[in-house]
């Protein structure tokens, strides 16, 4: 006990009343107003509790403190007076803070700040939405993946920031009257081939596909080494050049030089160069046959092989090249007598006649084109007088039936053997290479050297043998009529042709032989 009458055992947060009693300090309370035993305690009064008489007023919050309390403005509000705390409603000067004005970038990009009492909200621009994890951040709505399918099936959806577009797919274009971009866009396939929007090389033909196109090698062309066919970047080369090379086993410098020229012409060949290339090949052939050089020293059989190879290859090359010519009639002649006549037309329904110095050919146009071939129709005739040098002493092989009949009615071939070539060798070709069985025959009128009396004149063609060489044959060809210096032949196939004079000892005009030939 304190001698002055104040209890020394008062609990924390209390003061003594007298020597035997204590009272809790303001802001604290105990079970009874007067504390008489040291076991009692003073507890903080929560002035902010609901039943409290304290009222801070609107836009404010009550904050309890040890033994007291403070009124403060709620978040988003601030006191006009500037005082951070106050004790009652009468001192309250809280008013709303305009956060949007205070910090214009509060809503970051793509959002508009909207002030609210005590706070603000972010309103996203069209095409944006609030990010769930950060409700103040607007992010782009991907309309293309949101399952809304906002675009027509002929278009593809392109998401962009805050928006989207419905764009025509590559190789498609808006249908007439349709925009290209808005959600009402409707597209259709572009025909790049007919519209000229393709990038096909001139060695290829353009084929339209849905939404795209491809480039295929022209007929008679093949993809360049290592480049696939039917691609946008396909580049092709003319097969005729790559396959026309010297025959195996023949060693001739003159012939090698000829084929070097052919390969040179093929190396940088383009369809537009067809006319010049044809002329250059025939010029080279004309020179080769005018001056055969070491070809003349080859054994006869090898010479026949070379001739066979030249005739066969020339026909293929001319057929391939002439498909790239424009419509019309072409005639070329060369110093040693080589002559080319060519007619190129879109399919026409009439007969065609090609006239040359020593030969005339007549046939039906509709033979020229293979059905389904989109190219032009070509009919060609080449006279190659120089080929006679290489075909000297070439054998004539008759069909067994003709051979038998001749043996029965004649003494057969005289001892001096091989038939004599009376005419120029001519080669006929069409754009259609299937000419083994023509639906209507072709007629040739040959001008030639005089026929020796009592000799038989035969219309023949060169048959390329299995061994790559060949021989004269008469199958499918008949002699319609012959005069001293001209003969008319009719054949049911195309190849290389000539008129031969066979050394038969013909006593008089034989009706059987006439029928046979």
């Amino acid at each position: 006990q304190d001698s002055r009458g104040c209890a020394r055992w008062c609990p924390q947060d209390s003061s003594c009343v007298n020597a035997t009693a204590c009272r809790c300090n303001p802001g604290f309370s105990s079970f009874s107003e007067i504390i008489t035993t040291p076991m009692e305690t003073c507890d903080d009064i929560n002035e902010c509790a609901t039943l409290s008489k304290v009222s801070c007023g609107k836009f404010s919050d009550c904050w309890n403190t040890e033994g007291s309390y403070d009124c403060v403005c709620s978040p988003g509000y601030e006191p006009v007076s500037g005082a951070k705390t106050f004790k009652n409603e009468s001192e309250n000067t809280c008013q709303d803070v305009d956060e949007c004005q205070q910090n214009p970038r509060l809503c970051k990009s793509y959002g508009t700040c909207v002030n609210t009492l005590g706070s603000y909200t972010c309103q996203c621009l069209p095409g944006f939405k609030l990010k769930p994890e950060d409700p103040k951040l607007c992010t782009d709505v991907n309309e293309c993946t949101s399952g809304q399918n906002p675009c027509h099936s002929s278009t593809h959806c392109l998401n962009n920031v805050g928006s989207y577009q419905c764009r025509c797919r590559p190789g498609w274009q808006p249908i007439p009257g349709s925009p290209n971009g808005p959600n009402n866009t409707v597209c259709e396939d572009v025909d790049e081939c007919s519209s000229g929007q393709h990038q096909c090389d001139s060695s290829t033909v353009c084929f339209n596909t849905v939404g795209s196109y491809s480039c295929r090698c022209r007929p008679g062309w093949k993809p360049r080494h290592g480049i696939p066919n039917n691609q946008k970047d396909t580049v092709c080369e003319d097969m005729t050049f790559s396959t026309w090379t010297p025959p195996p086993g023949v060693h001739s410098q003159t012939l090698s030089r000829f084929f070097d020229k052919v390969q040179d012409l093929g190396r940088d060949y383009k369809p537009g160069l067809a006319n010049n290339t044809i002329q250059s090949i025939l010029q080279a052939l004309d020179e080769l046959l005018e001056a055969p050089g070491d070809l003349e020293t080859l054994p006869r059989l090898q010479q026949h092989c070379v001739a066979s190879h030249l005739l066969d290859g020339l026909e293929d090359v001319l057929r391939g090249l002439s498909k790239n010519l424009s419509n019309g009639l072409l005639n070329f002649s060369y110093p040693a007598g080589t002559e080319l006549s060519l007619e190129v037309q879109k399919q026409v329904d009439r007969s065609v006649t090609l006239r040359q110095n020593q030969a005339v050919m007549q046939l039906d146009w509709n033979q020229a084109q293979k059905s389904g071939d989109p190219g032009p129709s070509v009919v060609g005739l080449v006279s190659i007088p120089g080929m006679g040098k290489l075909l000297a002493e070439a054998p004539l092989v008759l069909e067994p039936e003709k051979q038998m009949l001749l043996h029965e009615t004649h003494q057969g071939l005289l001892q001096d053997g091989s038939p004599i070539l009376l005419s120029d060798v001519i080669s006929a070709f069409l754009s259609n290479n299937d000419t083994q069985n023509l639906s209507s025959p072709v007629t040739f009128t040959f001008s030639h050297r005089s026929v020796i009396p009592r000799q038989k004149v035969l219309c023949v063609f060169w048959e390329h043998g299995q061994n790559g060489c060949g021989h004269w044959a008469t199958t499918g060809c008949s002699t319609i009529g012959t005069r001293d210096t001209s003969t008319i032949c009719r054949c049911t196939h195309l190849s290389s042709f000539a008129v031969l004079m066979a050394h038969y000892d013909v006593q008089e005009e034989d009706p059987v032989l006439t029928v046979i030939t």
């Epitope: 090389d201 070097d260 040179d264 190396r267 940088d268 383009k270 369809p271 010049n276 250059s280």
Partner: antibody, heavy 118, light 106 residues
Amino acid sequence: QVQLVQSGAEVAKPGASVKLSCKASGYTFTNYWMQWIKQAPGQGLEWIGAVYPGDGDTRHTQKFKGKATLTADKSTSTAYMEVSSLRSEDTAVYYCARGFTAYGMDYWGQGTTVTVSS
Amino acid sequence: EIVLTQSPATMSASPGERVTMSCSASSSVSYMHWYQQKSGQSPKRWIYDTSKLASGVPARFSGSGSGTDYTFTISSMEPEDFATYYCQQWSSNPLTFGGGTKLEIK
């Protein structure tokens, strides 16, 4: 008759580019390659390359790859050569010529003089 | 690339004289062409495909050869023939020219 008319003389600074033209007339533009040839002062003829006007295909000598760009415009029958990153060694007369393997270069333009000087 | 070597590089001749120049190729060539160029002028095609005279070229000019060796001949020099002559091939890419033979008046 066949004619190849080239653009006028050019003076350019080092590093710049020039685009020369060659207008063809009197023949079918797509029936021949268009050749470009350089002749430096007092020197011989040097092939740069060729363009085929029918499809824009080009051939170049290695030395001029990336240096000379060859193009052709079928609609105007004009061939072009752009020479880039010019240096003093590019000072020369540049010719265009119509060419075909078997015939050589049968018609030539009058030439365009390019002078590279700082 | 095929290198074309022309010889001689320069030669002198008098009018009426026969002149021969050669062009040697590092590999076989099948199409050889020759051009004439006078000072300040564009080249002119003179002989093509080894031996064919270009339009307007006088018959005193001739060409021959095959493989790697080619010859250009003027049977009887005329004053207007003094010029530089170039050979050229396109048998393989790149196309190449010879260095030229300059024909001067003696």
